[in-house]
């Protein structure tokens, strides 16, 4: 039976050009974590394998850094990074646990003007 739960950083709102850390934590289980995948929509960003360490997808190498821990650091954020991110914990013997984090990246002008929407 899968007893574990995933806690995440929570959803994040950030500014264009900045950086953020996405983190998940698996608790309430004694299962062994064999691998953690980080994905956005259907794209694989990075893998942290218990034996082989980190692998960052080539298309994200410039802007994605491993860690801290099993987390992932996204740098030089763009509006295109707005979206849902998944931490997928592969464990033995439990199986797979998934956490979801939504990242909102705001244009700096949007952030400065608050909730008053800007006419283009």
């Amino acid at each position: 039976m899968m007893t574990g739960t995933i806690e995440t950083t929570g959803n994040i709102s950030a500014e264009k050009g900045g950086s953020i850390i996405l983190q998940c934590h698996l608790s309430s289980t004694t299962a062994q974590v064999t691998q953690v995948n980080w994905e956005q929509q259907d794209q694989l960003l990075a893998i942290c394998n218990a034996d082989l360490g980190w692998h960052i997808s080539p298309s994200f190498k410039d802007r994605v850094a491993p860690g801290p821990g099993l987390g992932l650091t996204l740098q030089s954020l763009t509006v295109n990074d707005t979206g849902e991110y998944f931490c997928i914990y592969h464990t033995y013997p439990d199986g797979t646990y998934t956490g979801r984090i939504f990242l909102e990246v705001l244009e700096s002008s949007v952030a400065e003007h608050g909730a008053r929407f800007q006419i283009p």
Epitope: T82, F102, L106, A115
Partner: antibody, heavy 118, light 112 residues
């Protein structure tokens, strides 16, 4: 002036699908996520999901995955929600709402009433 | 999913009253950066919901200062200092910190 103009009321038969449109004007369409909200029985509000008009990326409430499909047409600043395999449980008022995490759902469409009945 | 509990469900008032609506979440709404995405909405009959407060305590553009928001962690409050006729309707809180976003069940502000 910011406006979200939704398509009109719909009466559809069980098992059918339908698409609601939400045309945005008065602000930068790609700068804010577009959210969709269901109101059943004139009371409960439920978040269906959102779409990032900039890149078409979506995030769904798992409850509505397979029921709702969100898309956008950037050229016309219009967001769409298609509802599939309709049942009486889908009869509700559906709203589009522009905004996001930090600033809330700042602007709302007028709502589209969907009635599913044979 | 994060459960958002709103109390009371019904609030009978007289014009000029000061009232408070409570919103409690099943887990903390502060993310790892200390930001809390909690907003309040008023839904009047025959209209669309309207944003009153975002980020716990920030009044949206054009919202009168008789509306104020406060709270942290799991407990949040919307205060209306002097009830006016246009304030009657359903009030909802919305948490945006955890997926999926969830609304409270609503508080109906109605005349005594």
């Amino acid at each position: 002036e910011v406006q979200l103009q939704q398509s009109g009321p719909e009466l559809v038969k069980p098992g059918a699908s339908m698409k609601i449109s939400c045309k945005a004007s008065g602000y930068s369409f790609t700068g804010y996520t577009m959210n969709w909200v269901k109101q059943s029985h004139g009371k409960n509000l439920e978040w269906i999901g959102l779409i990032n008009p900039y890149n078409g990326g979506t995030s769904y409430n798992q409850k509505f995955k397979g029921k709702a499909t969100l898309t956008v047409d950037k050229s016309s600043s219009t967001a769409y929600m298609e509802l599939l395999s309709l049942t009486s449980e889908d009869s509700a008022v559906y709203y589009c709402a522009s905004g996001g995490l930090r600033y809330g759902f700042a602007y709302w469409g007028q709502g589209t009433t969907l009635t599913v009945s044979s | 999913d994060v459960v958002v509990t709103q109390t009371p469900l019904s609030l009978p008032v007289s014009f000029g009253d000061q009232v408070s609506i409570s919103c409690r979440s099943s887990q903390s709404l502060a993310n790892s950066y200390g930001n809390t995405y909690l907003s309040w909405y008023l839904h009047k009959p025959g209209q669309s919901p309207q944003l009153l407060i975002y980020g716990i305590s920030n009044r949206f553009s054009g919202v009168p200062d008789r509306f104020s928001g406060s709270g942290s962690g799991t407990d949040f409050t919307l205060k209306i200092s002097t009830i006016k006729p246009e304030d009657l309707g359903m009030y909802y809180c919305l948490q945006g910190t955890h997926q999926p976003l969830t609304f409270g069940a609503g508080t109906k502000l109605e005349l005594k």
